[in-house]
């Protein structure tokens, strides 16, 4: 796969993952009422990071925000923080990677600068993805713990906190947002890895040039204003290909601003 394709694909995959992280963070269905082996209720409860909702059989849905910071469990706060960190890093990663894309020319930015930016965005995407995966996994672990702790007849109020009336304990299981979050985090992570791989292709390694011998014969040395350009072609007028490029260049590539590696 060419560097441009790897970089572009990494960017697109990260972008999809990032969108998924935002979607998961905003979704209300992080935990949903467990319907298995429970008395069948005409009310369905589900909860997100920011509010809890109740949907009645009648179709009426009521959501209430968590209008407190101090009263919320520390784990929930931690999950919120991890998801926000993931989003923030993702935003920065996207902005950096836009400038790093090989197919986009900005001023006289050379490939080494693009390589550094590609690496930076890749690392940002990796951390963003990991942050989201950890956040979702922490929440999932919290659900599993609470699920086994809750019993059919237990004093419960707001999701098991407070209240003094015996109710059928509402048990919660994994909601759709968890699966969206895991997949999105994974995609962001994969996209980040692809960006880092693309960076390796963008970064020239001097050792690649040491083994190459240049035969300057009259037929393949052409005068160019600004310097002599050697060609490894035998009697052809093809331009020299960068050894680290991994294949034929596109027309756009050929017209890109010459870098110090273009000159012998």
């Amino acid at each position: 796969m060419s560097v441009t394709a790897c970089q572009g694909l990494g960017f697109v995959v990260s972008l999809i993952g990032f969108a998924g992280i935002i979607a998961a963070t905003c979704m209300d269905q992080w935990s949903t009422q467990d319907l298995y082996n429970n008395p069948v209720t005409a009310v369905f409860n589900y909860q997100g990071l920011w509010r809890s909702c109740v949907r009645e059989s009648s179709g009426f849905t009521e959501c209430r925000g968590y209008f407190t910071l101090l009263g919320l469990p520390a784990m929930l706060q931690a999950v919120r923080a991890l998801m926000i960190v993931g989003i923030v890093l993702g935003v920065i990663g996207i902005l950096v990677s836009i400038f790093a894309l090989k197919c986009i020319r900005i001023g006289s930015m050379d490939d080494s600068a693009k390589a550094k930016m590609t690496l930076t965005s890749g690392i940002l995407f990796i951390i963003s993805g990991i942050s989201a995966i950890i956040g979702v996994s922490v929440f999932a672990n919290m659900l599993v713990t609470n699920f086994w702790m809750s019993t059919a007849n237990m004093y419960s109020g707001m999701g098991g906190m407070g209240g003094m009336v015996q109710t059928v304990q509402t048990r919660y299981t994994f909601g759709a947002a968890l699966f969206v979050g895991w997949v999105a985090g994974g995609l962001t992570l994969i996209g980040g890895v692809m960006m880092c791989i693309a960076c390796r292709g963008l970064t020239p390694d001097d050792s690649n040039f040491k083994a190459v011998s240049y035969h300057a014969s009259g037929q393949n040395v052409a005068y160019r204003p600004g310097g002599f350009k050697a060609s490894t072609g035998f009697g052809s007028n093809t331009r020299n290909k960068k050894i680290y490029d991994g294949g034929a260049r596109t027309e756009d590539d050929e017209q890109s601003h010459p870098t110090k590696y273009d000159y012998v």
Epitope: S57, S58, Q166, V168, Q169
Partner: antibody
Framework: QVQMKESGAELVKPGASVKISCKAS????????MDWVKQRPGKGLEWIGQ????????NYNGKFKGKATLTADKSSSTADMQLSSLTSEDSAVYFC???????????WGQGTLVTVSA | DIQVTQSPSSLTVTAGEKVTMSCKSS????????????LTWYQQKPGQPPKLLIY???TRESGVPDRFTGSGFGTDFTLTISSVQAEDLAVYYC?????????FGSGTKLEIK
């Protein structure tokens, strides 16, 4: 305004079947559950079941499974209840009712009297 | 199924009096998600279909006179009529609106002297 108009009284023989209709108007028929309630003469209320006209989903009271079959036709905004293998125990007034806030029966039909007699 | 028990089965009062009737459920009708009690009260006058009075145990349906008040929590609920009027002659039913199948109480018959 919301209205529920039920079909007229029925006199049927034991063992036969009967179909009661409830035509709704004044609201989006397919987006609300339609419930059916039985009331025997001088007795209390019994919930039979409900149907969601939007997709045909149903919930039945176990006691009426096999006895009542609920259907709905979105095009005519009509809900039907078929009662089969009728006995004297099935002689009652049957109400259709629309589910509303708090899973309460907000709007009711006027009731259909079904009399099972030889 | 959830059992809903109403008491008394009948009440005879004079106009202007305050009346309370009770409804008990075999399981709590409190939903922890929104802290609402899924108990409903209906009024049924002779020859008419039931009419919704109160839902969520204490929320009065629009158009229902404010002399009707619902209260209670969990398993024990009460319907209060602060000043009974002649037109309040009816049977009052409470209903479990939380668990399937929905179940009704046997009713409290209110008679006016």
């Amino acid at each position: 305004q919301v209205q529920m108009k039920e079909s007229g009284a029925e006199l049927v023989k034991p063992g036969a079947s009967v179909k009661i209709s409830c035509k709704a108007s004044g609201y989006a028929f397919s987006t609300y559950w339609m419930d059916w309630v039985k009331q025997r003469p001088g007795k209390g209320l019994e919930w039979i079941g409900q149907i969601y006209p939007g997709n045909g989903d149903t919930n039945y009271n176990g006691k009426f499974k096999g006895k009542a079959t609920l259907t709905a036709d979105k095009s005519s905004s009509t809900a039907d209840m078929q009662l089969s293998s009728l006995t004297s125990e099935d002689s009652a007034v049957y109400f259709c009712a629309r589910l509303g806030y708090g899973n309460s029966f907000t709007y009711w039909g006027q009731g259909t009297l079904v009399t099972v007699s030889a | 199924d959830i059992q809903v028990t109403q008491s008394p089965s009948s009440l005879t009062v004079t106009a202007g009096e305050k009346v309370t009737m009770s409804c008990k459920s075999s399981q709590s009708l409190l939903n922890s998600g929104n802290q609402k009690n899924y108990l409903t009260w209906y009024q049924q006058k002779p020859g008419q279909p039931p009419k919704l009075l109160i839902y969520w145990a204490s929320t009065r349906e629009s158009g229902v006179p404010d002399r009707f008040t619902g209260s209670g929590f969990g398993t024990d609920f009460t319907l209060t009529i602060s000043s009974v009027q002649a037109e309040d002659l009816a049977v009052y039913y409470c209903q479990n609106a939380y668990f399937y199948p929905f179940t009704f109480g046997s009713g409290t018959k209110l008679e006016i002297k």
